[in-house]
Interface confidence: low
Amino acid sequence: DPASKSRSCGEVRQIYGAKGFSLSDVPQAEISGEHLRICPQGYTCCTSEMEENLANRSHAELETALRDSSRVLQAMLATQLRSFDDHFQHLLNDSERTLQATFPGAFGELYTQNARAFRDLYSELRLYYRGANLHLEETLAEFWARLLERLFKQLHPQLLLPDDYLDCLGKQAEALRPFGEAPRELRLRATRAFVAARSFVQGLGVASDVVRKVAQVPLGPECSRAVMKLVYCAHCLGVPGARPCPDYCRNVLKGCLANQADLDAEWRNLLDSMVLITDKFWGTSGVESVIGSVHTWLAEAINALQDNRDTLTAKVIQGCGNPKVNPQGPGPEEKRRRGKLAPRERPPSGTLEKLVSEAKAQLRDVQDFWISLPGTLCSEKMALSTASDDRCWNGMARGRYLPEVMGDGLANQINNPEVEVDITKPDMTIRQQIMQLKIMTNRLRSAYNGNDVDFQDASDDGSGSGSGDGCLDDLCSRKVSRKSSSSRTPLTHALPGLSEQEGQKTS
C-alpha cells in the first residue's frame, strides 16, 4: 500500500553503518526490490550493492563464529595435550635425574664409563614416546647387548677380549640371562606403557589437528546465500525486529555444515578409544609405574650382572673358550657392593588421576561437537527468536516456519529447503580428516591391546597423510637421539597441530 512505500530506512541505515559500510549506499525510504538476488523481492531498504555487502558480511560472520567455536575446542585439546605430555616427560626426566644422581655412587665406573649409553637409552625412549618410527623392543635389545659387552670388559680388565670374543658373548647372552629378569620385565612393561602414553597424546594431537583443518574449510556460495537470507534479509525487507525462527536457523546451518556433521561417528570413536586407553595408565604395567621407574630396572640389571659374575664368566669361557690374559691389565675388579634400589612401585602422586578425570569429563563434553554445532551456533551467535512461532523471521516474512528440521550429515540434506546441497560431492578435506580419525582410532585400539601399530605386519590402511605442524614448546627442546638413523623419522601425526618451536628447523 502507498503508506508502506514511504517507510523510512532509518533502522537499516543504523545497522548498515554499524557494520562499517558507507551510508551513502542506503536509500532514504523503501524502494522496489526487483534488483534483489537473495532476499525476497518486495519493497526494500537494500540496494544490490548493500545486498552483496551484507551477504559477504554474513558469510564472514558465520566463518568467524565457526572458527571461534573450533578455537575453544582446540584450546581445550592443546591444554590437555600439554598437561599429559608435561606429566609423561616429567616422569621420564625424573627417572633419568634419579639415575644420574644415584648410579655414580652405587655402581662407580660401571656407570660413569657407560653414562652415555644410559643417556642414549633415555634419548631413544623420549624419541619413541614422541612418535618416532623406531622399534622399542629392538632398541632395548641393542642397549642390553652394548651394555653387556662394556660391563663384561670392565669386570674383567685382566682379560683380552677381542671383537670376535665379544660377538660370542653376545650369542650366549640370551641363554645365560646375565642381567636376570630385568630386561624381559622392562621390555614387556615399557612397551605397553609407552605405547599407551604416546598413542593417547597423539590422539589429542590428531583431534586438535582435525578441528583446526576443518575450521579452515570454506563455506560454499549456496551457504552464503542462505545465511544472508537468515541474518540480514529481515532488515532489508523492513522487519528488522524479527529474529530468525529456531528451526529455520537449524536448517540453514545443518545445510551449511553438512560435511562437518559427517565427522561425528569417527570423532566419537576416537574419543571413546582415548577414554578407554586411560585404563592402561594404572597398575604395575601402567604408565606412571613404568615410565617413572626405568632406572630401577636398570639398577636391578647391573646388580644381577654383578651377582652372577662368576657363574656368567665360567659359562662364557665354557661356550667361547679361554680368552687371552692382558699382560698390562690390572687384576679382576673386586665385587662391588650392590646398588641400593628405590622402591619400584612409585606411590601415585595423584597428578595423573586428576589429569585423567578432567580429560574424561572434557572429552565426554565434546563428543557431540560436530552434530551439535548448528544448534550451538544458532543459539549462541544468531540471536534466535524467543517469540511465539508465528512472530519470527522465516526467510520470507515474519511468521511461522513450517518445514521440518533436517537430520545430521550430508546424506540427510537431500531435501533441505534452505540450502541447496549436492550430496554427491563430499568435501575432500573433511573426508581426509575422517580418515585421520579412523587411523588414529586404530592406533589407539592396537595400543589398548599392548601392540605398537607401526610394527605389525598387517598395518592399518596407511599412515596419516595430514601434516603434523611441529611440536610443543618444550617438546622440540627434547633431544631425540644421540644416534642418527635415517630410518627413525617421526610419524606424520607424532604431535600434530601445534606451533613450530621458535624458529627451530630440522632439515
Partner: antibody, heavy 124, light 105 residues
Amino acid sequence: AVTLDESGGGLQTPGRALSLVCKASGFTFSNYDMLWVRQAPGKGLEWVGVISSSGSSTNYGAAVKGRATISRDNGQNTVRLQLNNLRAEDTATYYCAKSAYGYYGSGVSDIDAWGLGTEVIVST
Amino acid sequence: ALTQPSSVSANPGETVKITCSGGSGNNYGWYQQKSPGSALVTVIYDNNKRPTDIPSRFSGSTSGSTGTLTITGVQAEDEAVYFCGGYDSSTYADIFGAGTTLTVL
C-alpha cells in the same frame, strides 16, 4: 632472534676467581641446555661444560673439573660460569652457547647458537 | 681430539666436503669462524640439522663414525675456518677438531 650476551671478561689475576655471565633472549630459556666453550689465542675450541635446562645437572671438561661451577637462573634468563684458582692457561675467549635440546645429554654437537664471546686474560 | 683436514680449497660454485672422524658418539656439529677469536656460527648441529638462518647449500651427514660437512656451490663468503664438534666416550668428554681452513679461490 636468539641472542647470547657474555660479560665479566677482562684482565684477571692468577689464583683468583672469575665469574662470567651470559644473558639470553629470543627463546624460551628454561627449555634448553646451555654450554660454555673457550678458545685460547691462536688455538682451537675447547669444551668447558654444560648445564641442563632445569639447572639440576652439570658436566665439566677435564681442564676445569674441580675449579668450574656452571649455574643458571631461569627467571632472569642467565647462565653463569665461575672458574676458581685461575691459571695462565685459562686465558681465552669464552663463548656461551645454546643447545638445540633440553634434557641433560646435550653435547657440543648440539649447539645451535653462540654468543659473541668475552675475552679473559689471566696474567700478573 | 677429532681429526679433520687442516685445509681445503675450491673454486666458487664447486662442492666442498670436509670430514671429521674420531668421535665415538656418532654425533657431530659444524661451526664456522671467519677469523680467530671472532664470532662462531653454527652451520650444522646434531649431524644434519641446519639452523633457520643458514643457507641450504650447507648440509651434514654421518657414516659410521665419520661426520661430513658438504657445501654445495661454495661462495666467496663461505671462506672461513670450520670446526667440528663431537664426543669421545673413552674420556667421557665433548671435543672439537682442530679446524679446517676453507679457501675459496
